[in-house]
Interface confidence: low
Amino acid sequence: QRLPRMQEDSPLGGGSSGEDDPLGEEDLPSEEDSPREEDPPGEEDLPGEEDLPGEEDLPEVKPKSEEEGSLKLEDLPTVEAPGDPQEPQNNAHRDKEGDDQSHWRYGGDPPWPRVSPACAGRFQSPVDIRPQLAAFCPALRPLELLGFQLPPLPELRLRNNGHSVQLTLPPGLEMALGPGREYRALQLHLHWGAAGRPGSEHTVEGHRFPAEIHVVHLSTAFARVDEALGRPGGLAVLAAFLEEGPEENSAYEQLLSRLEEIAEEGSETQVPGLDISALLPSDFSRYFQYEGSLTTPPCAQGVIWTVFNQTVMLSAKQLHTLSDTLWGPGDSRLQLNFRATQPLNGRVIEASFPAGVDSSPRAAEPVQLNSCLAAGD
């Protein structure tokens, strides 16, 4: 059952070429651009993180004996994944709250590479997607999702971890990026902006969308998240942009209607199981893919990012609820929880469809500048 409230086909970048980002962070950086310090989003910055880093929010991996077969997405330990240290890409804030976890914030000090050196790596996320420069790769087959339609029971944990709202997923949600590229879903979370300020992490030709959903997966080749961190293809994230539409999105409403219960940082509630696939676009065949990193500390690299071409539609009220209900630590609203786009540094974004041909209204005679690498290489 797919949501009817999605654009039938909404090419990313259609009609959005060169649109200025309200935060002034995205100046359509070229692939050669060096990392830049993230501009502090403002007084609503999100302070530290407690539980999981985002997709990133990877789980602290519990001993298997604690709950056999269950992948826990709790606090991801700070891991120093390999990477070439560069100038700071993001700022972070460290403090201690009774444990040894690193705490960080968007737009604060010290820089994220001091929290985790991997944050200064060369192949970081998010990135600006330029359909014209994407390499059409016919080997990228439609994504396969199995077991994503969950029954109401058992209920799922919905948590405000101080830097996002995260839904922990039960075992059994399987996803395949292609033959032999199989993953298990662990958790999903969202990134958003503030009133009148979009907050997606990825951008398309410099255009930032209102919000973005990330569904984080662990490769079946690994039993634990900490084993997969920094390993090519160890983690995979499905990402979709959320846009404003005329109707309420019933699937998202099942989560958004519960946000007030977890408005406080660190709080959580239980929600009935739902159709997780209904939170994603209905077209699993058209997407962009590249290798990047977690977008929050520990910023581990080797993450396979799949960004849907189709967007998901939420009502204006729903987008407002998302951006205006939750609170982070220190009496600050949980808003603008996205990282600045990072340089590609030579990476090629692949497309499962000829994006350069049909997704940008600017190119009358598109030229494919990049060649496709065989999927899975």
Epitope: E260, E261, A263, E264, S267, E268, T269, W327
Partner: antibody, heavy 121, light 111 residues
Framework: EVQLLESGGGLVQPGGSLRLSCAAS????????MTWVRQAPGKGLEWVGI???????WYADSVKGRFTISRDNSKNTLYLQMNSLRAEDTAVYYC???????????????WGQGTLVTVSS | DIQMTQSPSFLSASVGDRVTITCQAS???????LSWYQQKPGKAPKLLIY???NLPSGVPSRFSGSGSGTDFTLTISSLQCEDFATYYC????????????FGGGTKVEIK
């Protein structure tokens, strides 16, 4: 320093009405859930009701339909309108602020000093 | 409705003693829905523990909270003179039908 000051308590006959106020200083109440709690003489604490930061309200079964919680953000004041009062409503009434902004979680700090409501004929 | 059963109701202890108070919920609740309060005669309650295990600033570290699901505990590691008071747990769940309730209280008296 955040302070909450209740007022409006007193003696009222059964079936009567009373409106309690809780004035806040040192903080903007509009960002916080606020709760009312009462304590009958010599008894324990009893939760009465709560208003969320989005002005949704929930009540204990014992007062549902009789009590109404509201707030006036311009006055930074919380209210408890009590109608159809009964003898068992006699108690010290406390208002309290959610310890953190936004949500409904059960952590309240600080509390007002309380105001005594006596329902008797 | 949810019920919070607190025990013991009364507790006699001496300065320096380790004191443990338990609170049992009639149904599973999230740790973020459980807090503990201290009340002295004629005074308003004071928040001691929130989210089951967290101490607000200004609360002495001899107070600690633990537990999850239905069983929660407040521990005073070394009782001080100023700790003789009544302690209440507050637990519940914030859902479409928000419900919360206090435990019956535990009065800690000087032995």
């Amino acid at each position: 320093e955040v302070q909450l000051l209740e007022s409006g308590g007193g003696l009222v006959q059964p079936g009567g009405s009373l409106r309690l106020s809780c004035a806040a200083s040192g903080i903007d109440l509009s960002n916080y859930a606020m709760t009312w709690v009462r304590q009958a003489p010599g008894k324990g604490l009893e939760w009465v009701g709560i208003i969320s930061s989005n002005d949704k309200t929930w009540y204990a079964d014992s007062v549902k339909g009789r009590f109404t919680i509201s707030r006036d953000n311009s006055k930074n004041t919380l209210y408890l309108q009590m109608n159809s009062l009964r003898a068992e409503d006699t108690a010290v009434y406390y208002c309290a602020k959610a310890a953190m902004p936004g949500g409904l979680k059960n952590a309240f700090d600080p509390w007002g000093q309380g105001t005594l409501v006596t329902v008797s004929s | 409705d949810i019920q919070m059963t607190q025990s013991p109701s009364f507790l006699s202890a001496s300065v320096g003693d380790r004191v443990t108070i338990t609170c049992q919920a009639s149904q599973t609740i999230g740790g973020s829905d459980l807090s503990w309060y201290q009340q002295k005669p004629g005074k308003a309650p004071k928040l001691l523990i929130y989210y089951a295990t967290n101490l607000p600033s200004g609360v002495p570290s001899r107070f600690s909270g633990s537990g999850s699901g239905t069983d929660f505990t407040l521990t005073i590691s070394s009782l001080q003179c100023e700790d003789f008071a009544t302690y209440y747990c507050l637990g519940g769940y914030a859902a479409a039908s928000y419900r919360t309730a206090f435990g019956g209280g535990t009065k800690v008296e000087i032995k």
